[in-house]
Interface confidence: low
């Protein structure tokens, strides 16, 4: 299934810790892309893989 | 937080009508605002919601054609428009903002 | 859409009672499912969302709970201004539909 991705509202600028907020339009429910190093529903977690 | 509705509506049938829900408080662009409807003795339903920062909509199937959500980010108000009315399109219809600020209500009457 | 099915339509209790009212989705809903109380004259006041994350200013004495398909939502210790109808809302999807609603009233 293909996601559709909107920037999600100001009000969700803090929902992923160490991300970029994505709303879901299939879900219309905010996701996290993380960034480089990090995992988590809302990056909130240190790769130690990486 | 606050949200203002318009006024009472009496309106003919087959006329159509425009509500207004203005935010103070806080402005419309960091989150959805929806429209919701209560027929007399009825229960809640959802009409639909925009995202006033794009004007992207969303409208349950049964208000697709009935009802059309705007927002004006200049004046922080979104507006609800009714078409074709019909005496079961009387009811109050209620706004909100991040489905935990609601506005008080606005009656619309449908009557020859 | 996700139908969800609320019981029951109206109960009586006593004041100090517990009352539990049920929604049950057509759909698993993830638990995004949010509980409203609503009094004549008045918008919709949300008490809880994401099951059982009580709204702030909200007494201890609301509570929900459940997952998949089946969601409750519970007064306890009844007061008089408790009066009103219940509400479910799922938002798991773009289609937001509430719950049939609960009129509860004081014996």
């Known amino acids: 299934v293909v996601s559709h991705f909107n920037d999600c509202p100001d009000s969700h600028t803090q929902f992923c810790f160490h991300g970029t907020c994505r709303f879901l339009v299939q879900e219309d429910k905010p996701a996290c892309v993380c960034h480089s190093g990090y995992v988590g529903a809302r990056c909130e977690h240190a790769d130690l893989l990486a | 937080v606050q949200l203002q509705q318009s006024g009472a509506e009496l309106v003919r049938p087959g006329a159509s009508v425009k509500l207004s829900c203005t935010a103070s408080g806080f402005n419309i662009k960091d989150d959805y605002m929806y429209w919701v409807k209560q027929r007399p003795e009825q229960g809640l339903e959802w009409i639909g919601r925009?995202?006033?920062?794009?004007?992207?909509?969303k409208y349950a199937p049964k208000f697709q054609d009935k009802a059309t959500i705007t927002a004006d980010t200049s004046s922080n108000t979104a507006y609800l428009h009714l078409s074709s009315l019909t005496s079961e399109d009387t009811a109050v219809f209620y706004c909100?903002?991040?489905?935990?600020?609601w506005g008080q209500g606005t009656l619309v009457t449908v009557s020859a | 859409d996700i139908q969800m099915t609320q019981s029951p339509s109206s109960l009586s209790a006593s004041l100090g009672g517990k009352v539990t009212i049920t929604c049950k989705a057509s759909q698993d809903i993830n638990k995004y499912i949010a509980w409203y109380q609503h009094k004549p004259g008045k918008g919709p006041r949300l008490f809880i969302h994401y099951t059982s994350k009580l709204q702030p200013g909200i007494p201890s004495r609301f509570s929900g709970s459940g997952s998949g398909r089946d969601y409750s939502f519970s007064i306890s210790n009844l007061e008089p201004e408790d009066i009103a109808t219940y509400y479910c809302?799922?938002?798991?999807?773009?289609?937001?539909?509430f719950g049939g609603g609960t009129k509860l009233e004081i014996k």
């Open positions: 909100a903002y991040r489905r935990a600020y």
């Open positions: 809302l799922q938002y798991d999807n773009l289609l937001y539909t």
């Open positions: 925009i995202d006033p920062a794009n004007g992207n909509t």
